[in-house]
């Protein structure tokens, strides 16, 4: 008779990231007997839901179940049936839903209600759907990348698990860019965090962390573009907007009603003598950069120093992982290499934005034109946000690491969120046998 392998004693968890532009489902797996060890949880699957973000279903809430079904069915196939009932499912919605809630709490609640009803139909242990705060989004992103980099482990390693990992236990800062918001989170060096709203205290694995975090709502790449268009159309002499952030020869008609649909453009709203206008690209990086800078109010700062819009930002400290759209955009532009200096990035952006639209379309035939057309803006926006918004310099640019995955797990807030909600980050350093802990993040 053959020796039968003992069943793996593993656990699974599912987190859905309901972002402004799309929803992704992540499946995590870990050995049951090592729950409190650092670095044991890893991602086994990402399923990107085909379609827009959940906030777009506000007029079609009854269809949210249809929208989620493929990825949820995928989860039922990936996770062994015997584990279904004990697998927790969490859905966290971010800035797209924060914006919808600003417009109508009732509509946001209706969307979440249908999401909850839909997810409750599956054989998992559904734990709820909620809009997470910007502070949570920043904090959980910071926990994720430092957990995956092994920064919370007390065992110093003589080897590096990822190319940009330093062997010291200094944590990485986290830079997250979404479609509707952006987060900056890091441990400042012996600096008091002057605004209580931006201060977090954690005790993780026996060590205290004083963390700075801020989420800038409306400063994700998609909402920043809407802001820029709303700002620029104010001073347009007619219904033609010559825009340096789009390639020469690019043309697109925009409905004014779409422009003013988002709360992010309210501050620029005015009565225009036309219902539509045409963007005509002129592809000039420097002018695009200048136009973007006008979105950052740097004239007012009630603290020792600020990022923009009067928000406190301590001096930058240490290395930073830049993920989500920071990574996707820079990856598309082929600018994620550690060897590319800030000056070189700027140089390459100048060349890219100046390329004629017809040429760009031919070079990237497989990419949807809407997304393709926005890379010039997005790349320029990333540079503007990091340099002028967050005060990175040509020197400190080298401390930014554009990262998609660490050890096979996506960088982002979802892993940190699950680790916290499943009580897998102990406040104290676990002994060799796992103990139960009552104090968690």
């Amino acid at each position: 008779t053959q020796n039968k392998a003992l069943p793996e004693n593993v656990k699974y968890g599912i987190v859905l990231d309901a972002g402004s532009s799309h929803t992704s489902l992540y499946i995590y797996k870990w050995p049951a007997e090592k729950e409190n060890d650092t670095g044991v949880v890893h991602q086994v699957e990402e399923c990107r839901v085909k379609g827009p973000g959940i906030s777009k279903f506000v007029q079609k809430v009854n269809e949210i179940g249809i929208y989620l079904t493929d990825c949820m069915a995928r989860a039922t196939a990936v996770i062994p049936r015997s584990q279904h009932q004990e697998t927790p499912v969490y859905l966290g919605a971010t800035a797209g839903m924060r914006l919808l809630r600003m417009e109508s709490e009732e509509l946001a609640d209706r969307v979440l209600d249908v999401v909850e009803r839909s997810l409750s139909n599956y054989p998992f242990d559904f734990q709820g759907a909620r809009i997470i705060t910007g502070q949570e989004e920043g904090a959980y992103g910071w926990i994720t990348i430092n957990y995956l980099l092994g920064k919370f482990s007390q065992k110093t390693r003589w080897f590096s698990i990822v190319p940009y990992e330093t062997n010291n236990q200094e944590t990485f800062g986290a830079l997250d860019l979404g479609g509707a918001s952006t987060q900056v989170t890091f441990v400042p060096q012996n600096q008091t965090i002057e605004s209580p709203d931006n201060a977090l205290q954690f005790r993780l694995y026996g060590k205290d962390y004083n963390v700075y975090t801020h989420s800038f709502l409306c400063y994700g790449k998609d909402q920043a573009l809407w802001q820029k268009l709303a700002k620029d159309i104010q001073v347009a002499s007619n219904e033609i907007l010559r825009d340096p952030c789009f390639h020469p020869g690019y043309k697109k008609v925009v409905n004014v009603s779409d422009l003013y649909k988002t709360p992010c453009t309210k501050r620029f709203e005015m009565t225009l003598p036309f219902q539509q206008f045409e963007i005509q690209g002129i592809g000039n990086y420097q002018q695009c950069h200048q136009s973007i800078l006008e979105l950052f109010n740097t004239s007012y700062c009630p603290y020792s120093q600020c990022a923009f819009n009067g928000i406190f930002l301590p001096p930058l400290q240490g290395d930073f992982g830049a993920f989500s759209a920071f990574y996707f955009v820079m990856k598309f532009l082929n600018l994620t290499s550690e060897k590319v200096s800030q000056e070189k990035v700027t140089e390459m952006m100048k060349k890219f934005c100046a390329q004629p639209w017809e040429e760009i379309k031919t070079s990237y035939a497989g990419v949807k034109e809407k997304y393709l057309s926005e890379y010039c803006f997005s790349g320029t926006y990333i540079l503007s946000l990091l340099l002028q918004g967050y005060h990175f310099t040509a020197d400190s640019w080298e401390h930014i690491h554009f990262i998609g995955k660490i050890q096979g797990s996506d960088a982002g807030w979802t892993l940190g969120y699950m680790l916290n909600l499943t009580n897998m980050i102990p406040a104290e350093q676990p002994l060799s046998t796992p103990l139960s802990h009552s104090t968690y993040v």
Epitope: K50, K56, Q59, T69, S118
Partner: antibody
Amino acid sequence: EVQLQQSGAELVKPGASVKLSCIVSGFNIKDTYINWVKQRPEQGLEWIGRIDPANGNTKYDPKFQGKATMTSDTSSNTAYLHLSSLTSDDSAVYYCARWGYDDEEADYFDSWGQGTTLTVSS
Amino acid sequence: DIVLTQSPASLAVSLGQRATISCRASESVDNYGISFMNWFQQKPGQPPKLLIYAASNQGSGVPARFSGSGSGTDFSLNILPMEEVDAAMYFCHQSKEVPWTFGGGTKLEIK
């Protein structure tokens, strides 16, 4: 505008193999699923299977397993259907199609290729 | 496999009148609170076109005269008022379970 452009008609001998292509334009192939559907002259529709080009995951009708292999190439935004050990029963029009939500708005729409006519004959 | 039986096999309806096509599944196509039943239209020499998804939702750009209903095993497609351009083959399709299957089709003609 979303378009699926299929390769031209094929005349092949029994026992041979063929690879049909479906070039997608107007959207990123990774943002959708691609289905393959078979239709014999004056007959109904048969679902062969579906591929998720984002990760290569496939679902097949078991009766086409071993006969059909679906693949995709995200760099060229193209889906492929490879048919092997061809017999006269494989003579049909083969469609590639996508149906589902648009990636910007909550609009559910479908797009089909024009169909590739495969004739298996000696 | 889930077998879909369409009825009638052919149907002639006067312009402006209601056309009703039925589809019965050999087992329920409901799952997770959703009815995984779709309807397609096909005209000669053309690929099929999605009309209805998840039993009752209209595809993008589909005229309001097309509606779908039903749950479990019994579904129907209604066209009201019937127009000349609606003469075509109609297929029901289930996507609850692999293999996804189509009904045998209903030929709709103008009376």
